[in-house]
C-alpha cells in the first residue's frame, strides 16, 4: 500500500481542516488508514482522524481544530496499521479556504432596486470576519449567456443593483462566495443559490 498523491490540506480558519490524498489502488480509507495530527506546541497531544473514501483510491479527512491562530503548525502522519506511509506538516494560515456565505436573500420590494444580502460565515471574534470580500454570481435560467459576476470589495455582506440591469419578466438565480486577501486564500465554495422573478416597471418612452 502506497500513497500516490500526497495529502494536501485546507483550513476554514475556524474549526475544520480538510485533507485529501490518493492511494495507489482501491482502498477502504476508514478501515485501513488513520491520519494523526498534532499541533507543534509544548505538551500537545496527537489526535486521530478517520478518513472517508473520496472515489475509489481517494481519501478525505476532516481534522477538528480548536480554533486557528497564525502561528499554528501541525505535524501529519498517515498510518496503515503499524506502517507509516507518509509524514508531513501543515500550517493552516497558509492554506485557507473560507467557509461559504449563507442565507442569501434577494429583496425585490425596494423601488426598482434589487438588494441581495447574505450572512458572513464567521463569528465576530474570528480574524476573517472583518477581512472577507465577496463575489456575487447572477444568471438567467432562460439564457445561459446572461451570466454576470459582481465583486463586492467592501465588508458589508450586501449588494444593490438596479433591477433594470437585468431583463424583466424572467427568472434569475444568484449565489455568493468569499475570499480573504490578507491570507491570500482560495475562494470559498458557492453558497446555495436563490431564485427570484425579475420584474420592474419599464420607464415610459418620451416622444
Amino acid at each position: 500500500m502506497k500513497v500516490l498523491q500526497e495529502p494536501t490540506c485546507v483550513s476554514d480558519y475556524m474549526s475544520i481542516s480538510t485533507c485529501e490524498w490518493k492511494m495507489n489502488g482501491p482502498t477502504n480509507c476508514s478501515t485501513e488508514l488513520r491520519l494523526l495530527y498534532q499541533l507543534v506546541f509544548l505538551l500537545s497531544e496527537a489526535h486521530t482522524c478517520i478518513p472517508e473514501n473520496n472515489g475509489g483510491a481517494g481519501c478525505v479527512c476532516h481534522l477538528l481544530m480548536d480554533d486557528v491562530v497564525s502561528a499554528d503548525n501541525y505535524t501529519l502522519d498517515l498510518w496503515a496499521g503499524q506502517q507509516l506511509l507518509w509524514k508531513g506538516s501543515f500550517k493552516p494560515s497558509e492554506h485557507v479556504k473560507p467557509r461559504a456565505p449563507g442565507n442569501l436573500t434577494v429583496h425585490t420590494n425596494v423601488s426598482d432596486t434589487l438588494l441581495l444580502t447574505w450572512s458572513n460565515p464567521y463569528p465576530p471574534d474570528n480574524y476573517l470576519y472583518n477581512h472577507l470580500t465577496y463575489a456575487v454570481n447572477i444568471w438567467s435560467e432562460n439564457d445561459p449567456a446572461d451570466f454576470r459576476i459582481y465583486n463586492v470589495t467592501y465588508l458589508e455582506p450586501s449588494l444593490r443593483i438596479a433591477a433594470s440591469t437585468l431583463k424583466s419578466g424572467i427568472s434569475y438565480r444568484a449565489r455568493v462566495r468569499a475570499w480573504a486577501q490578507c491570507y491570500n486564500t482560495t475562494w470559498s465554495e458557492w453558497s446555495p443559490s436563490t431564485k427570484w422573478h425579475n420584474s420592474y416597471r419599464e420607464p415610459f418612452e418620451q416622444h
Partner: antibody, heavy 120, light 108 residues
C-alpha cells in the same frame, strides 16, 4: 466555579524535599495540560514544569531539571510537584496553572499559590 | 532558549491616558504563541491576551495586543484606576515557555 487549590508548601532546609499538590475543581483535569510557575519574593514569574493531559509527556525548566518531578492523578483531579535537593533559590510562591489549548499556551486558570521557603 | 525583554521597566501614567508596553524576543518568535498577563499585589496573574492579539474571556476591549517576529506590544487604550499593576509577556513555543521580567504600570 473553575478553581485550582495548591497545598504542601512550607519551610524546608537546603537539600531537603517537599511535595506540592494542586486540587482542581469545576473542570476535568484530564482534558488539560497542567503547569507549575513560581515567583520568588519581589521578582517576576518563572516557568517551572508542565505535563501533558494524559501524563505521557513532561517538560522542565533547566533550573529544576533532575531535581523536580511533575505528575498527575487524573481520576483524583490532582496535580503534583515533587521537589528534592532544594536550594535557597527555589524559595518562591508556586502556582498551579491550567493551559487551555484554545488559548495556545495562555494560562487561563491560576491557583492562589503555595509558599515554599528554603532556609537553614 | 528565547529571552523576552520588556520595556520600560516602569511606566508612570495617569488614568485616561494610553499605555504602550513592549516585549522583545531575542530571536524570531513567529512559530510560538505570545500571551500577556496582569498581576496585582498579593494576587495570582490574570491572562489578558493570547495568540499575540486575542483577548481572553471577560477582558475589556481597551486591552489589545499586536506584533510579530520579535516585537510585540500590549496597548491599554484608556487607563482605568484598576489597570495599574505589573504586566508580563510570555512565550509558549514547541519546546519551551518563557516570561518577560515584567513592566510595572504605576499612577503618575
Amino acid at each position: 466555579e473553575v478553581q485550582l487549590l495548591e497545598s504542601g508548601g512550607g519551610l524546608v532546609q537546603p537539600g531537603g524535599s517537599l511535595r506540592l499538590s494542586c486540587a482542581a475543581s469545576g473542570f476535568t483535569l484530564s482534558s488539560y495540560a497542567m503547569h507549575w510557575v513560581r515567583q520568588a519574593p519581589g521578582k517576576g514569574l518563572e516557568y517551572v514544569s508542565g505535563i501533558s493531559s494524559n501524563g505521557g509527556s513532561t517538560y522542565y525548566a533547566n533550573s529544576v531539571k533532575g531535581r523536580f518531578t511533575i505528575s498527575r492523578d487524573n481520576p483524583k483531579n490532582t496535580l503534583f510537584l515533587q521537589m528534592s535537593s532544594l536550594r535557597a533559590e527555589d524559595t518562591a510562591v508556586y502556582y498551579c496553572v491550567r493551559v487551555f489549548v484554545r488559548y495556545r499556551g495562555g494560562m487561563d486558570v491560576w491557583g492562589q499559590g503555595t509558599t515554599v521557603t528554603v532556609s537553614s | 532558549e528565547i529571552v523576552l525583554t520588556q520595556s520600560p521597566g516602569t511606566l508612570s501614567l495617569s488614568p485616561g491616558e494610553r499605555a504602550t508596553l513592549s516585549c522583545r524576543a531575542s530571536q524570531d518568535a513567529s512559530n510560538a504563541y505570545l500571551a500577556w498577563y496582569q498581576q496585582k499585589p498579593g494576587q495570582a496573574p490574570r491572562l489578558l491576551i493570547y495568540g499575540t492579539s486575542r483577548r481572553a474571556t471577560g477582558i475589556p476591549d481597551r486591552f489589545s495586543g499586536s506584533g510579530s517576529g520579535t516585537d510585540f506590544t500590549l496597548t491599554i487604550s484608556r487607563l482605568e484606576p484598576e489597570d495599574f499593576a505589573v504586566y508580563y509577556c510570555q512565550l509558549y513555543g514547541s519546546s519551551s515557555v518563557t516570561f518577560g521580567q515584567g513592566t510595572k504600570l504605576e499612577i503618575k
